[in-house]
């Protein structure tokens, strides 16, 4: 039976949401973002073994072909399934503005 | 200047659409799909160097953090940006049906 959320490689090894603490300098934003000065970046990291959090039919195909032709076809990859918005205070040509970014922080993850 | 479509690793090395010829047996579909017997599977394969086909702000962040912490944060990954639908003739409990799958064949690719 398929169990799309149990990691066969051991706890925490498979595709999941991780938080990485980063400064504006780390992100390359220091010259245009005023705030926040530090960001808890949520991103998708981990392995995508067979049937683990498969996003769609394409991911199933990719895994099957990867097993057949590992040198040609890579395994599915852990990427965001959805995002959390974030608001930044940034410098603009006209001054300072608040800007919402919808695709900045991963909310949950799957394998594609 | 940013050039999101020029591969710095050489032609064909970066994230792009590839076609892989596969049989139903290769795909693990032989027991439930009647036709087609063979599929030209389009999928996204290749490296995601800095600024190449970045899908969104998250991809930019991921690349910047990957450069800082390569052991912790993986590089962005080449995945479908959109899909082409495909119709399969398949066996069902009641006989045979035509079924459209919207997420089976990659149409174009980007780095996330």
């Amino acid at each position: 039976a398929r169990n799309g959320d149990r990691c066969p490689l051991g706890p925490g090894r498979c595709c999941r949401l991780h938080t990485v603490h980063a400064s504006l300098e780390d992100l390359g934003w220091a010259d245009w973002v005023l705030s926040p000065r530090e960001v808890q970046v949520t991103m998708c990291i981990g392995a995508c073994p067979s049937q683990f959090r498969e996003a769609n039919m394409h991911a199933q195909i990719k895994m099957n072909l990867h097993r057949l032709k590992p040198d040609t076809v890579p395994a599915p990859c852990c990427v965001p399934a959805s995002y959390n918005p974030m608001v930044l205070i940034q410098k603009t040509d006209t001054g300072v503005s608040l800007q919402t970014y919808d695709d900045l922080l991963a909310k949950d993850c799957h394998c594609v | 200047a940013r050039n999101g479509d020029r591969c710095p690793l050489g032609p064909g090395r970066c994230c792009r659409l590839h076609t892989v010829h596969a049989s139903l047996e290769d795909l693990g579909w032989a027991d439930w799909v009647l036709s087609p017997r063979e599929v030209q599977v389009t999928m996204c394969i290749g490296a995601c160097p800095s600024q190449f086909r970045e899908a969104n702000m998250h991809a930019q962040i991921k690349m910047n953090l990957h450069r800082l912490k390569p052991d912790t944060v993986p590089a962005p990954c080449c995945v479908p940006a959109s899909y082409n639908p495909m119709v399969l003739i398949q066996k069902t409990d009641t006989g045979v049906s035509l079924q459209t799958y919207d997420d089976l064949l990659a149409k174009d690719c980007h780095c996330v």
């Epitope: 926040p36 608001v87 001054g95 503005s97 | -």
Partner: antibody, heavy 120, light 107 residues
Framework: QVQLVQSGAEVKKPGATVKVSCKAS????????MSWVRQAPGQGLEWMGY????????VYAQKLQGRVTMTTDTSTSTAYMELRSLRSDDTAVYYC?????????????WGQGTLVTVSS | DIQMTQSPSSVSASVGDRVTITCRAS??????LAWYQQKPGKAPKLLIY???SLQSGVPSRFSGSGSGTDFTLTISSLQPEDFATYYC?????????FGGGTKVEIK
């Protein structure tokens, strides 16, 4: 704990200038920006402007443009709000409020408030 | 500027009552809405940020919901210390703007 302590009440004549201070403690001052908000007697809250405590960049409410200046002194972890050409309708309690660590456009904590009375 | 309209302007309620306050933005603000509580002679206090996230130390009887233009603050079971004025504030663009306030009074 995080605290914002403001200067004391002021009585000013119309046309004068007032400068209110806001001393921060309990966090790294230049890591989070500061807004100023005022509240006229019996009225609601009115945002006056924002200053980046890191860079000094400011944005002011349109109606106060030209009369208000916000500054900071990172050496003393203090933010200042100066309002010029005072009028009677500037009588209000003035608050400094730090941007929240969770969301930059939410305000937490707030100073205790400084009453500025403009009267001839 | 984004206008914030709060309703009702006042509500009379008893201890233990469920109280709901609404806030409407004149244009979409995603989920960038904060709620504050203010007691007489005191500074406002942040209760909810990002529409539904409870600020640390705030009792769980307070909750927020909504996105886009329509938002709600709910006090599930009113306590004596909850009688105060509540303000919403949009944080999607400068200038930051507040609703007119809702006074929660003892019935």
């Amino acid at each position: 704990q995080v605290q914002l302590v403001q200067s004391g009440a002021e009585v000013k004549k119309p046309g004068a200038t007032v400068k209110v201070s806001c001393k921060a403690s309990g966090y790294t001052f230049d890591s989070l920006g500061m807004s100023w908000v005022r509240q006229a007697p019996g009225q609601g809250l009115e945002w006056m402007g924002y200053i980046s405590t890191y860079s000094g960049d400011t944005v002011y409410a349109q109606k106060l443009q030209g009369r208000v200046t916000m500054t900071t002194d990172t050496s003393t972890s203090t933010a200042y709000m100066e309002l010029r050409s005072l009028r009677s309708d500037d009588t209000a309690v003035y608050y400094c409020a730090r941007e929240s660590g969770q969301q930059v456009s939410a305000l937490d904590p707030w100073g205790q408030g400084t009453l500025v009375t403009v009267s001839s | 500027d984004i206008q914030m309209t709060q309703s009702p302007s006042s509500v009379s309620a008893s201890v233990g009552d469920r109280v709901t306050i609404t806030c409407r933005a004149s244009q979409g603000i995603s989920r960038w809405l904060a709620w504050y509580q203010q007691k007489p002679g005191k500074a406002p206090k942040l209760l909810i940020y990002a529409a539904s996230s409870l600020q640390s130390g705030v009792p769980s009887r307070f909750s927020g919901s909504g996105s886009g233009t329509d938002f709600t603050l709910t006090i599930s079971s009113l306590q004596p210390e909850d009688f105060a004025t509540y303000y919403c504030q949009q944080g999607a663009s400068f200038p930051l703007t507040f609703g007119g306030g809702t006074k929660v009074e003892i019935k």
